[in-house]
């Protein structure tokens, strides 16, 4: 026969019970605080070291770029692509056109300054978009020449040249001594038209996006 | 061989026109670009004017824009310039020039022996 | 415009002996490896006569005694050995921008 229980015993059973209960809540309790001030801190560190990193970059190009213009990018947006200002931007690329009239290598020269080249077009969408800034009127340098008169068309950033992704005027390129390539609006479009080096034009510089 | 011939220099007033005319033989002339260069008594050589192959492109300097004109006709293989509103500086020998494209740039490889315009009162 | 200085603006050589003529550019004439300067020799009463093209290439028919070299905004034509014939006043051109410009000239004199 199993002796009853004294009602203090059942009590303090209870009350025993509860203190195990209300003590492990109270140490998870302190241990999620713990955490979350870990996690906290640790992001905080790296949220902060990587703003840091992200203002040392900055830094160290506004020695070449006055004034940036970024906009964040990625899965997590948590990467900035930036262009100088007024540079505009598209994929990867930032663009620069220059209105100042100048021979094709002193347009190339110009670009290089700005850690640039002229304009390598490599679709029909990049030229869309870069034709959108431009004035009909007008004709442009790109990043296309063939120094020896030999109809080796060749990019200045060494980009292969395909006949397939070309946008020349009809009947164009049409003159051996016409050896760098610009863009221009004729019989309503734009396209290429080989003109002489030495006649000064406006031109178009390309960069890669700047990634901080 | 290649000949480039000038004639069509003179005395003339200021304010008066003369043309020039450059005669070539010798070489197709419609493939090739073709200068005026112009050289005043006892000085160096001053560049006047440039004309394309296919005609699409001519260029002056400053000091002639609005008052000379150059032209070719490639059907008689001839080279020309206009001059107006001539001025005592412009006085010198002028002559034509044929120009070879060197990689983004070009040379004169031939010289016409050159035809002297004097202008005075 | 490129200005095209040329020194000295003359020159007495002795037959056999060198002559160097120099020529600057206020601004580079060369893109890369194309050194886009020219060489003229002109003797009295006759129209200029190309020696050198891109600085450093002679003309066909010029003898091998005349040389150029250079690049950027430095170049120099030197004749050895100088002979008799070669009197006469040496430019330099450019043409890598328009307006295509000429230096003021050096005349070489044979003692």
């Known amino acids: 026969m199993v002796p009853e229980e004294e009602p203090q015993d059942r009590e303090k059973g209870v009350w025993w019970f509860q203190l195990k209960v209300w003590s492990v809540a109270v140490v998870s309790i302190l241990l999620l605080c713990v955490c979350f001030t870990v996690s906290s801190v640790a992001s905080h560190n790296f949220m902060y070291s990587k703003t840091v990193k992200r203002l040392s970059k900055l830094q160290e190009y506004q020695q070449y770029y006055p004034s940036l213009t970024c906009v964040m990018e990625g899965k997590d947006m948590e990467d900035w692509s930036c262009c100088p200002t007024p540079w505009t931007s598209f994929q990867s690329s930032c663009y620069f056109i220059s209105t100042v009239m100048q021979s094709w290598t002193k347009s190339q020269n110009n670009c290089s300054v700005m850690g640039a080249d002229l304009v390598v077009i490599n679709t029909k969408e990049e030229q869309d978009f870069i034709t959108q800034n431009l004035k009909i009127n007008s004709a442009y340098f790109l990043g296309l020449s063939d120094p020896k008169g030999w109809r080796h068309w060749q990019w200045v950033d060494q980009t292969p040249y395909n006949k397939n992704v070309t946008f020349w005027h009809s009947g164009e390129p049409n003159s051996p001594d016409e050896r760098c390539a610009i863009i221009n609006f004729r019989s309503e479009e734009w396209g290429w038209n080989d003109v002489h080096c030495h006649v000064p034009q406006k031109s178009i510089c390309k960069m890669k996006k700047i990634y901080i | 061989e290649v000949q480039l011939v000038e004639s069509g220099g003179g005395l003339v007033k200021p304010g008066g026109s003369l043309r020039l005319s450059c005669a070539a033989s010798g070489f197709t002339f419609s493939s090739y670009g073709m200068s005026w260069v112009r050289q005043a008594p006892g000085k160096g050589l001053e560049w006047v004017s440039t004309i394309s192959s296919g005609d699409s492109y001519t260029y002056y300097p400053d000091s002639v824009k609005g008052r000379f004109t150059i032209s070719r006709d490639n059907a008689k293989n001839s080279l020309y310039l206009q001059m107006n509103s001539l001025r005592a500086e412009d006085t010198a020998v002028y002559y034509c020039a044929r120009q070879i494209y060197y990689d983004y740039a070009y040379y004169f490889d031939f010289w016409g022996q050159g035809t002297t315009v004097t202008v005075s009162s | 415009d490129i200005v095209l200085t040329q020194s000295p603006a003359s020159l007495a050589v002795s037959p056999g002996q060198r002559a160097t003529i120099t020529c600057r550019a206020s601004?580079?004439?060369?893109?890369?490896?194309?050194?886009?300067m020219h060489w003229y020799q002109q003797k009295p009463g006759q129209p200029p006569k190309l020696l050198i093209y891109g600085a450093s290439n002679l003309e066909s028919g010029v003898p091998a005694r005349f040389s150029g070299s250079g690049s950027e905004t430095d170049f120099t034509l030197t004749i050895n050995p100088v002979e008799a014939e070669d009197t006469a006043n040496y430019f330099c051109?450019?043409?890598?921008?328009?307006?295509?410009?000429f230096g003021g000239g050096t005349k070489v004199e044979i003692k």
């Open positions: 051109q450019q043409s890598i921008e328009d307006p295509p410009t």
């Open positions: 601004e580079s004439v060369s893109f890369r490896t194309s050194h886009l």
